[in-house]
């Protein structure tokens, strides 16, 4: 025979073709072998001009030989070489799909590889490529766009060899936080206007709570839990009212100690206090803020001061909440009763933001001692909280 060639080469098959011998022959003897692959010999009919080679090893150079037989006679042997394709990785899957991230996993090919080429493309035509190492079988995609269809493809590499690509399709979820647990998550969902929002305590859709979000102060993402601005709301309320909350979230209000406890139990929170009086402003930030549960009488933790208002909350750190009908302070007298408010009183206060609006009598008004002392009732005050790691979360959103 003559003109031995191979065609239709894949990672495991090839088709051998040849020109028949001029003389009539009984059979052709085909043999093929590769590096680290034992020789296989097959005999086919003398009127055959092609033979399908199967069960080949991927990415392997094979030597193919063929000769003709007629009775006891044998022709000379002709030889051809071919290399099988690199086989593809298998079972490419996208898991842990979020609004900005997904995890791609796959099974390696049988052949050894020098790496993988990953290509992922969004429906709008944005294409990204990345090459990963030979021992890698998963890759975290980041900085994806929410609510977007993606096609991810992977190809095995071995030196100059490239396998066929396999692909998977997935769609990122629409919102970063479908059930935001605080205003920072609402903001990271793309809501940047201050106002009323529904949050879900612990991300549980059954635990909905309407809150006012401050989306502008120092980067935004704050749950406002106290506002004093005009004296229309009565803050000389009892224990039950302070536990549950009261007032109009758009105006003067108190969010409630039970809610504060549940929110601050979700993670590490920081406190911000904004004060305004006759055109002057001041603020205080505490990088650790939490409120205990009812068993602790809503014990306050507030640490790590920075700001311009002065560190007046330090005096109240570690104190339980007091109202006129539940006296938990360390004074002989009832601080809430004496100062017509409620707070984490000690004996009695440096801060009295729930005091009597507009009352400039000593210690009776809306006071922040280290800013305006105890004989000036501050016109505007807000207390608000957000996760201490908000800056990191915000950075992630901006990159996306």
């Amino acid at each position: 025979p003559s003109g031995l060639v191979t065609a239709n080469i894949t990672d495991s098959e090839a088709l051998a073709r040849w020109q028949p011998a001029i003389a009539t022959v009984d059979s052709y003897v085909i043999s093929y072998t590769g590096e680290k692959v034992p020789e296989i010999t097959r005999t086919v009919s003398g009127n055959t001009v092609e033979y399908a080679l199967t069960d080949l090893e991927p990415a392997t150079e094979y030597t193919l030989r063929i000769f003709a037989e007629k009775g006891p006679q044998k022709s000379s042997t002709i030889t051809a070489k071919f290399t099988t394709d690199l086989d593809s990785p298998r079972d490419l899957t996208a898991t842990e799909v979020q609004s900005e991230t997904a995890l791609l996993t796959w099974r390696p090919p049988r052949a050894s590889v020098t790496g993988y080429l990953l290509v992922y493309e969004s429906v709008d035509g944005t294409v990204k490529e990345v090459i990963v190492g030979p021992d890698t079988t998963s890759y975290s995609l980041a900085d994806l766009s929410p609510s977007t269809h993606y096609t991810a493809k992977i190809q095995a590499l071995n030196g100059p060899l490239r396998s066929n690509m396999i692909q998977t399709i997935f769609t990122t979820i629409g919102l970063l936080y479908p059930f935001p647990k605080d205003c920072s998550q609402a903001m990271l969902n793309g809501d940047t206007t201050s106002g009323l929002y529904t949050i879900y305590l612990n991300g549980d859709k059954a635990e909905a709570l309407e809150v006012f979000c401050d989306m502008t102060s120092d980067g935004g993402g704050w749950i406002v839990f106290l506002r004093r601005k005009n004296g229309r709301e009565n803050f000389y309320q009892n224990w039950k009212a302070y536990a549950a909350g009261f007032g109009d979230r758009r105006e003067e209000f108190w969010l409630g100690l039970d809610n504060l406890n549940k929110i601050t139990a979700q993670g590490q929170y920081e406190l911000r206090v904004d004060l305004r009086d006759h055109g002057e402003t001041a603020f205080a930030v505490y990088d650790k803020f939490s409120v205990g549960d009812a068993k602790t009488r809503y014990k306050l933790k507030v640490e790590g001061y920075s700001g311009t208002a002065g560190d007046s909350m330090a005096y109240h750190n570690g104190r339980s909440f007091s109202t006129f009908d539940k006296d938990t302070d360390s004074a002989i007298t009832n601080c809430a009763l004496s100062y017509k408010g409620a707070f984490w009183y000690r004996n009695c206060h440096r801060v009295n933001l729930m005091g009597r609006y507009g009352d400039n009598n000593h210690s009776q008004g809306v006071n922040w001692f280290h800013w305006k002392g105890h004989e000036h009732s501050i016109q505007f005050a807000e207390m608000k909280l957000r996760p201490s790691n908000f800056r990191n979360l915000e950075g992630r959103r901006k990159r996306a």
């Epitope: 330090a314 005096y315 004074a331 000690r346 009695c348 210690s363």
Partner: antibody, heavy 120, light 107 residues
């Protein structure tokens, strides 16, 4: 146990300088404000200076403002008082005291004191 | 600055008697008042903080009361180890100031 140990006192001439140190142990030093309180021989107690836990805020009595500098090294659990332009009326036993909240404070732990005598 | 005035300056008292020391602030200080005990050659020791709270380890015969500008330290039954000088201190504002002291000695 919680302990404060002062050092650095001595006899010094008017106008000269002295640096007092206070070594703290037994508590998380940077969680607390620290203070210097002095007591002239046979007299009462006088607060001199205070510093917040982080060292970011400092406070002084009018009698020492501009002459004394309070500082702390939280890595070394140490408090310092740099006293410049010393006067005879600065003669006193100087106590290092641990605060509880910061500015406007309660002193719950005291050292044994170090004597500073300013005399020519 | 807030002035703290203690009275009396000296209080000779027999063992077992009740002792009352008063302290007056020159301005309203809520309950921001502390009491200290100092024995000769020793550092002061905190007895009462926030006008009425007993510091850990202090005997219950010591008590404090008052609010606003007038405060009292009471020793219900004077013991030999209680002979010392007692100081009040306002922690309402900086500079925190001390009273001039009350010396309780043996009668």
């Amino acid at each position: 146990q919680v302990q404060l140990v002062e050092s650095g006192g001595g006899l010094v001439q008017p106008g000269r300088s002295l640096r007092l140190s206070c070594a703290a142990s037994g508590f998380t030093f940077d969680d607390y404000a620290m203070h210097w309180v002095r007591q002239a021989p046979g007299k009462g107690l006088e607060w001199v200076s205070g510093i917040s836990g982080s060292g970011g805020s400092t406070y002084y009595a009018d009698s020492v403002k501009g002459r004394f500098t309070i500082s702390r090294d939280n890595a070394k659990n140490s408090l310092y008082l740099q006293m410049n332009s010393l006067r005879a009326e600065d003669t006193a036993l100087y106590y290092c005291a641990k605060g509880t909240v910061g500015e406007g404070d309660t002193f719950d732990i005291w050292g044994q004191g170090t004597m500073v005598t300013v005399s020519s | 600055d807030i002035q703290m005035t203690q009275s009396p300056a000296s209080l000779p008292t027999p063992v077992g008697d009740r002792v009352t020391i008063t302290c007056r602030a020159s301005q309203y200080i809520q309950g921001f008042l502390n009491w200290y005990q100092q024995k000769p050659g020793k550092a002061p020791k905190l007895l009462i903080y926030d006008a009425s709270n007993l510091e850990t380890g202090v005997p219950s015969r010591f008590s404090g009361s008052g609010s606003g500008t007038d405060f009292t330290l009471t020793i219900s039954s004077l013991q030999p180890e209680d002979f010392a000088t007692y100081y009040c201190q306002q922690s309402y504002s900086t500079p925190q100031t001390f009273g001039q002291g009350t010396k309780v000695d043996i009668k």
